[in-house]
Structures are given as C-alpha cells and as structure tokens.
C-alpha cells in the first residue's frame, strides 16, 4: 500500500526534511506550508494548525513561496529619467530601466536605481568607446587630420578632406576647407594620419588631451562609502 | 582615510539661491571626476550634474540653466551653485567621485539638505 500522505502541518520523520512548497517551524518542530508568491503568513502555524496567509497591501509584493510576516516594499517609482518596465504587483517589485540616451550609473538587483544621461563629447573630442545601457561614453581628442565639429554622444573623430589646394587648414574642431577645385574625401573614417604629400596637409591644432584613461560617468558598484539607501513609496 | 563631505545646504524661498560645497580629503582629487546627485523625500535617487577632467560639465534637463557645477583642483573641492530654486528641487544633495577609467562610483559623502518653500 502506498504511504499516507501527511496534511500539514505534521512531525517530520527524523533526519528527512520538510516537502516543496514547505517550512520547518522551529517553534510548533512541525512542516508546514509556505504562502504562495504574492501573499504572505499573517498567521504562523502551530502543532495543530497550518499557516494563515494574506495577500499583500498595495505597493508590496511577494515572489516567492514564503513565510515572510510581511510583503516587500516595492522601490520608489521610475524618475522622470526612467521606463518602467515592470510594474509593481503583489508578485513582483517595479523595475525600472533608463531611457534612450541615458545609462545605468548605479544597478541594483533587477533594474536601475539611478540613471545619468551620457556624455556628449565637445568639438575636437569624438567617442572612443560609446555608451552601453550600463556605462557612459568615453571622450578622446581628435588626433592629427582628423576632427569633431559636433557636442555629440554618438560622433567620432572623422579625417579632414584632403585638398588639392588647402584654404583653411582643419584643426580638431574643423574641417579643412579647399580652395574651389573639388577636395577628394579620405575614404578612412577614423584614420589617424592621412597619406598626403605634407605642403597640402592641413595644419591641426592638437588639444589638451584628457588623462589616457578616459573618465567614464558610469558608478556601478559602490566601493568607498555607500550611496544613500533607497527611498520606497506607494502607488 | 577617503572623505567627501558636503556643506552649503538650509532653508530658501523659492528664487533664491544656495552655494553647494564637497571637500574631498584622501585621495587624489584630480584623478576622479566629480557628480551632484539628489534624493527627494521618498524619492529614488536623480542625478543633477557632473564635471569632466577637461572641466566639461552635463546636466539634467530639470537645473540646466539655473544650476552650475564647478570644482576647485587646488582646493579639493566641488561646487554647485544653485540659482532661482524651486520647491521641486527640495531634495538631499549628495556629491560623488569617480576614478577615472572605471566605471564605477567609489566615493559618495553623506550629503547636504536643500528646503526650498513656495
């Protein structure tokens, strides 16, 4: 005959541990059930009667089978810089996540807890490396024949035109300008130094280049003194 | 020991203006780059401004024009100078520091109040 199965909440055989979906109570020494993800135990279990859940208040929630006493807060809602990408329910916290053209610049478990917008290079500075959802543009100086006219998140440096005849040199911040006969365009974007002979090569002004270590505006993980704790407030 | 701490902070009527302070003590102040983020009462945190090693600056769209950031190299210190204030930008201020080339905050002070009243 196959085994009885046992209600909760019951003795558990010594040695073997309480089944899915339950919990040893150290105070009753019996298993008993777990509340179901969006509840909590409002009653805890005693030898004789098993937990009594309830659903979570608004603006908390539950995702787990648990025994909490009670819900999770759900975090503070989205800023004006933020998505929400998941609402807050009895069964899960509100997430968060930046809008186009900011990142990450400090993540908790799910979601972001504060966003910064990226950086936008000035003239004769492009972008060495671009912004991902965590972490900020990184800025570098335009290097010799090549330059950024643009305050940008997105441009790199690009080669000056090459002239048949130079009116202006390029610098960092400008393109050559040509005398009236057509300039051939340098078909390398990003090129350093440009195969020209050196009396049409166009004059740069190299600008006070930033440490080699570009700075970067993203703070992810919080290593000196912690950031502020969490605001939590309700719908 | 590493150190920010944050001064400049009280009580303005709407319009007026404040002087943010954060004297950084501990590490070497010209390798990290500077931020002012803020905390509204039960608020998660808004990130108002920062400033790059070449002094470049960014702000939110909330203080653009109104606020100005700034630091002081030789003085270890970061400035926000906060000018015609609304009672939206009643907050706790804090500033931050980042080392250069990581990605990561590595410092943050304990920050300032900002009460703006209408």
């Known amino acids: 005959l196959p085994a009885q199965v046992a209600f909760t909440p019951y003795a558990p055989e010594p040695g073997s541990t309480c089944r899915l979906r339950e919990y040893y109570d150290q105070t009753a020494q019996m298993c008993c059930s777990k509340c179901s993800p969006g509840q909590h135990a409002k009653v805890f279990c005693t030898k004789t009667s098993d937990t009594v859940c309830d659903s979570c208040e608004d603006s908390t929630y539950t995702q787990l089978w648990n025994w909490v006493p009670e819900c999770l807060s759900c975090g503070s809602r989205c800023s004006s810089d933020q998505v929400e990408t998941q609402a807050c329910t009895r069964e899960q916290n509100r997430i968060c996540t930046c809008r186009p053209g900011w990142y990450c610049a400090l993540s908790k478990q799910e979601g972001c807890r504060l966003c910064a917008p990226l950086r936008k290079c000035r003239p004769g500075f492009g972008v060495a490396r671009p912004g991902t959802e965590t972490s900020d543009v990184v800025c570098k100086p335009c290097a010799p024949g090549t330059f950024s006219n643009t305050t940008s998140s997105t441009d790199i440096c690009r080669p000056h035109q090459i002239c048949n005849v130079v009116a202006i040199p390029g610098n960092a911040s400008m393109d050559a300008v040509c005398t009236s006969t057509s300039p051939t365009r340098s078909m390398a974007p990003g090129a350093v130094h440009l195969p020209q002979p050196v009396s049409t090569r166009s004059q740069h002004t190299q600008p006070t280049p930033e440490p080699s270590t570009a700075p970067s505006t993203s703070f992810l993980l919080p290593m000196g003194p912690s950031p502020p704790a969490e605001g939590s407030t309700g719908d | 020991h590493v150190q920010l701490v944050e001064s400049g902070g009280g009580s303005v009527q709407a319009g007026g203006s404040l002087r943010l302070s954060c004297a950084a003590s501990?590490?070497?102040?010209?390798?990290?780059?500077m931020s002012w983020v803020r905390q509204a009462p039960g608020k998660g945190l808004e990130w108002v401004s920062a400033?790059?090693?070449?002094?470049?600056?960014n702000y939110s769209d909330s203080v653009k024009g109104r606020f100005t950031i700034s630091k002081d190299n030789a003085k270890n210190t970061l400035y926000l100078q906060m000018n015609s204030l609304k009672p939206e930008d009643t907050a706790m201020y804090y500033c931050?520091?980042?080392?250069?080339?990581?990605?990561?905050?590595?410092?943050w002070g304990q920050g300032t109040q900002v009460t703006v009243s209408s």
């Open positions: 400033i790059y090693s070449d002094d470049s600056d």
């Open positions: 931050a520091a980042i080392r250069i080339g990581t990605d990561q905050y590595k410092f």
């Open positions: 501990g590490f070497t102040f010209s390798s990290y780059y």
